[in-house]
């Protein structure tokens, strides 16, 4: 039950995280005009990974896409790549984890297969989260560097009294969304990996010892300490040992209150 809960929670947390990564990637507010200690302007600038926008105090907002690919800074391209890789890995991870969920039955899929899929999706979520965190952190570092550079030359003299003000940019909302989303995806991935350990069949093999009494046979199975008699409706559980410990779900193959479809 705990394994199912951990796996389910890991899936949900990762789903929220990946949705957040997608949202952050699409958001325009990766960097926003720094309003502190700046001359008060009637326009507000903000930039995303794909376009830059200007909101005038009149209420009019104008956004322009970065239509060039080669003319963009390498760091921006790197951030774009990291975020896209994060989204792609996360999406594949989600797809894999749906089939790996213990509460979903697909044919006669073995628990070992589900365990492998859970581990795979977990690793994908971890890498996806790391990509998002790395992307956002690279962008944030770029902003910090540019911020201090533009603070150093905040006013660029252009001869005489004429001055031109450099627009300084600070962290936008998308950075915080990205960090939180990346963290959630990472946590979800770790939870999936933990759930995988609970799903995986134990490798330790025990010799099953049968004691034959004169009346009726009772077999003792050391793994789960479950006894089964050779009589009545339980005769289909006669095969006691089959190379490793089995989960209750596998032993009791007829529907029970513990089965979720």
């Amino acid at each position: 039950m705990a394994v199912t809960a951990c796996q389910g929670l890991g899936f949900v947390v990762s789903l929220i995280g990946i949705a957040g990564i997608i949202a952050a990637t699409c958001m325009d507010q990766w960097s926003t005009q720094d309003l502190y200690n700046n001359p008060v302007t009637a326009v507000f600038n903000y930039q995303g990974l794909w376009r830059s926008c200007v909101r005038e105090s009149s209420g009019f907002t104008e956004c322009r896409g970065y239509f060039t690919l080669l003319g963009l800074p390498a760091m921006l391209q790197a951030v774009r790549a990291l975020m896209i890789v994060g989204i792609v890995l996360g999406a594949i991870g989600l797809l894999v984890s749906i089939f790996a969920l213990k509460c979903i039955r697909i044919g006669s899929m073995e628990d070992s297969a589900k365990a492998n899929m859970t581990l795979t999706s977990g690793i994908m979520f971890i890498v996806s989260g790391l990509c998002a965190i790395a992307g956002v952190s690279v962008f944030a570092n770029m902003l910090v560097t540019n911020f201090w550079m533009s603070t150093a030359n905040m006013y660029t003299g252009m001869g005489g009294m004429v001055q031109t003000v450099q627009t300084r940019y600070t962290f936008g909302a998308a950075l915080f969304v990205g960090w939180v989303a990346g963290g959630l995806t990472l946590i979800g991935g770790v939870m999936m990996c933990i759930a995988c350990r609970g799903l995986a069949p134990e490798e330790t093999n025990y010799k099953a010892v049968s004691y034959h009494a004169s009346g009726h046979s009772v077999a003792y199975k050391p793994g789960g300490f479950k006894a089964s008699t050779g009589f009545g409706s339980n005769t289909k559980n006669k095969k006691i040992y089959d190379g490793g410990a089995r989960t209750e779900d596998e032993v009791q193959s007829y529907p029970s209150k513990h089965d979720y479809v």
Epitope: S52, S58, G59
Partner: antibody, heavy 117, light 113 residues
Framework: QVQLQQSGAELVRPGTSVKVSCKAS????????IDWVKQRPGQGLEWIGV???????NYNENFKGKATLTADKSSSTAYMQLSSLTSDDSAVYFC???????????WGQGTLVTVSA | DIVMTQSPSSLTVTAGEKVTMTCKSS????????????LTWYQQKPGQPPKLLIY???TRESGVPDRFTGSGSGTDFTLTISSVQAEDLAVYYC?????????FGSGTKLEIK
């Protein structure tokens, strides 16, 4: 069509205050900023401040304490109160609505305020 | 505050002539975010409120005759009337629409001979 209708001319005593109104029609009042501009007779234009109905105000430092901008969304009317009037406050006061580029596209007809003993 | 300097303060021309007036700001009105210059030109005829002619330094407001052209960038701006008409008799103001407080130039008075 968009219209800004200002209140009539005022003749006031020095030291008193006056409230000029600007009734907007033909557009969603809450969505646009209303600027106020002063023009002394035969002089140039001077920006007083701006109000966003329901949001906030921004004043020219030279008019802080002199002008108070308010708005009543229910009647789509902007107001400017001028206090402690002196002869320097005798001017035509315009209200105007902002447009692209923060430009002032629609103007009221102006309200002449005369401060005289 | 941004200082807007207009020149000449007045000029007298004959109908059909080309007229150029300039406006200089103490700081650049160019916004790096959208590469637009936040400078506006107004025309004020006697006894009337100002009328918007040009915004973003060069974008003509709808309904404004195409003889009015705005140009310039950064700190230096120009308003050109390609062929002056009798109805163009007015005072022309430039305005900084970028920095608060918004500031107007002292105006250029256009008179027709």
């Amino acid at each position: 069509q968009v219209q800004l209708q200002q209140s009539g001319a005022e003749l006031v005593r020095p030291g008193t205050s006056v409230k000029v109104s600007c009734k907007a029609s033909g557009y969603a009042f809450s969505n646009y900023l209303i600027d106020w501009v002063k023009q002394r007779p035969g002089q140039g234009l001077e920006w007083i401040g701006v109000i966003h109905p329901g949001s906030g105000t921004n004043y020219n430092e030279n008019f802080k304490g002199k002008a108070t901008l308010t708005a009543d969304k229910s009647s789509s009317t902007a107001y400017m109160q001028l206090s402690s009037l002196t002869s320097d406050d005798s001017a035509v006061y315009f209200c105007s609505r902002r447009w692209y580029g923060n430009s002032l596209i629609y103007w009221g007809q102006g309200t002449l305020v005369t401060v005289s003993a | 505050d941004i200082v807007m300097t207009q020149s000449p303060s007045s000029l007298t021309v004959t109908a059909g002539e080309k007229v150029t007036m300039t406006c200089k700001s103490s700081q650049s009105l160019l916004n790096s975010g959208n590469q637009r210059n936040y400078l506006t030109w107004y025309q004020q005829k006697p006894g009337q409120p100002p009328k918007l002619l040009i915004y973003w330094a060069s974008t003509r407001e709808s309904g404004v005759p195409d003889r009015f052209t705005g140009s310039g960038s950064g700190t230096d701006f120009t308003l050109t009337i390609s062929s002056v008409q009798a109805e163009d008799l007015a005072v022309y103001y430039c305005q900084n629409d970028y920095f608060y407080p918004f500031t107007f130039g002292s105006g250029t008075k256009l008179e027709i001979k």
